[in-house]
């Protein structure tokens, strides 16, 4: 019995269906086929879980969190024992193993391994201002999404006709910050932060109001 090489990893957007491949070749009839799918969750590598089981011509549910979401892609028994997981969740990310036995066929490699990564688009970012908005001050524009896998990058732009940040601004696209030194009236206006990763984008708007000192009455 020989389980075929798997592609290594599967990526899927949260909520979509993942197909985890596993196929094998055997010299015996599929009368005593036994397939166990296990997962080593990324969030808890010490706690392997059963995903689905095929034994004695019957399918059995694995861990409760997979109930109603998992099945074999084809009619069993078969040499293609790939599974699907519907409505994927972040917690489904992990290393999946298919263990195949088909007595009396012994020997060979009977385990296939596939990694699953559930991707999450950036959640609506929060746009905030840190620091005094008084003329001549330094301010930091902050942009941060609570969710996003892979980790989002952040692009700030000023919504004026140049779409460029003020000349005194420095941007950190990883941290999502823009530092504007020595703010002036020209720093005022509407800014857009776009949080993006491989599967999506999300935006917030922020307006910076530079406060000019009131002329003192004599």
């Amino acid at each position: 019995l020989e389980v075929s090489e798997s592609p290594g990893s599967v990526q899927v957007a949260r909520g979509q269906t993942a197909v985890l491949p596993c196929a094998f070749s055997t010299s015996a009839a599929l009368l005593n086929l036994n397939v166990i799918w296990m997962v080593i969750p990324l969030s808890n590598a010490n706690q392997p879980e059963q995903v689905i089981l095929y034994q004695g011509g019957q399918m059995f549910d694995g861990a409760l969190r997979f109930h109603g979401r998992v099945g074999f892609t084809g009619t069993m028994p078969a040499t293609n024992v790939s599974i699907f997981i519907n409505n994927t969740q972040l917690s489904d990310t992990g290393t999946y193993q298919c263990l195949v036995n088909n007595l009396p066929d012994r020997g060979g490699r009977n385990i296939g391994v596939t990694g699953l990564t559930v991707l999450v688009p950036p959640s609506a970012p929060q746009c905030q201002i840190q620091g005094s908005q008084d003329l001549g001050s330094d301010v930091i524009l902050l942009c941060s999404s609570e969710e996003g896998i892979p980790r989002p990058t952040y692009l700030w732009e000023k919504l004026d006709n140049t779409l460029k940040l003020p000349p005194t601004a420095t941007q950190d696209q990883v941290q999502g910050t823009v530092t504007i030194r020595n703010i002036s009236a020209l720093s005022s206006g509407l800014y857009q932060c776009v949080a993006s990763n491989a599967i999506g984008t999300s935006t917030c708007l922020l307006d910076l109001q530079v406060i000019s000192p009131q002329p003192r009455s004599v």
Epitope: L186, S188, L190, Q192, T203, D207
Partner: antibody
Framework: EVQLLESGPGLVKPSQTLSLTCTVS??????????WSWIRQHPGKGLEWIGY???????YYNPSLKSRVTISVDTSKNQFSLKLSSVTAADTAVYYC?????????????WGQGTLVTVSS | QPGLTQPPSMSYGLGQTATLTCTGN????????AAWLQQHQGHPPKLLSY???NGPSGISERLSASRSGNTASLTISGLQPEDEADYYC???????????FGGGTKLTVL
């Protein structure tokens, strides 16, 4: 209560420049935090955002109209203005001035009554 | 060509509940939510709600706005004759970097 009022010629010849002014009362353009916009509505059709100006003079125009639009502000008169060059019959519309702010998530909470501009020779 | 899609017209009976829809994409409604405007014939638009179900003061409690995915909805319960108007949705489009509007829905109260 903030009020906006558009003024300007109702008839413009093709290839000329359309010029409109919006006078703001009941609030100061200079108070900051407001984005003073122009929006138009073609006869019997939907709305189209043209652009905005901030009290500091910073402008931002709809990319689809950018090459023909100029918006300016006169804080001493509490007015902002629109110029749209090289007009054609397709620019015939009711032109509104409007205000957007952070408090309404940058949507338009105050509108002028609108002025119909016809482009015709 | 409007950036958001609305049904051109809808008719409901007096006292019924109307649900108006507005469909965009992930760069506008899916990202930012939507605002709703009401326009009576010969009048400027009036802001009813923004960012899904926030609204200016003085707006009728018969109105309720929501969003599901890339579609925004405005529900008007207990329809009155004064609800007969054109309704527009609007959203900031982060890709176009512009405010976009729907083509409008003409609501008729029978």
């Amino acid at each position: 209560e903030v009020q906006l009022l558009e003024s300007g010629p109702g008839l413009v010849k093709p290839s000329q420049t359309l010029s409109l002014t919006c006078t703001v009362s009941g609030g100061s353009i200079s108070s900051g935090g407001y984005y003073w916009s122009w929006i138009r509505q073609h006869p019997g059709k939907g709305l189209e955002w043209i652009g905005y100006i901030y009290y500091s003079g910073s402008t931002y125009y709809n990319p689809s109209l950018k090459s023909r639009v100029t918006i300016s502000v006169d804080t001493s008169k509490n007015q902002f203005s629109l110029k749209l060059s090289s007009v054609t019959a397709a620019d015939t519309a009711v032109y509104y001035c409007a205000r957007a702010s952070r408090s309404t998530d940058y949507y338009f909470d105050y509108w002028g009554q609108g002025t119909l501009v016809t482009v015709s020779s | 060509q409007p950036g958001l899609t609305q049904p051109p017209s809808m008719s409901y009976g007096l006292g019924q509940t109307a649900t108006l829809t507005c469909t965009g994409n992930r760069n506008n409604i899916g990202d930012q939510g939507a605002a709703w405007l009401q326009q009576h014939q010969g009048h400027p638009p009036k802001l009813l709600s923004y960012r899904n179900n926030n609204g200016p003061s003085g707006i009728s409690e018969r109105l309720s706005a929501s969003r599901s995915g890339n579609t925004a909805s405005l529900t008007i319960s207990g329809l009155q004759p004064e609800d007969e108007a054109d309704y527009y949705c609007s959203a900031w489009d982060s890709s176009l970097r512009a405010w976009v509007f729907g083509g409008g829905t003409k609501l008729t109260v029978l």
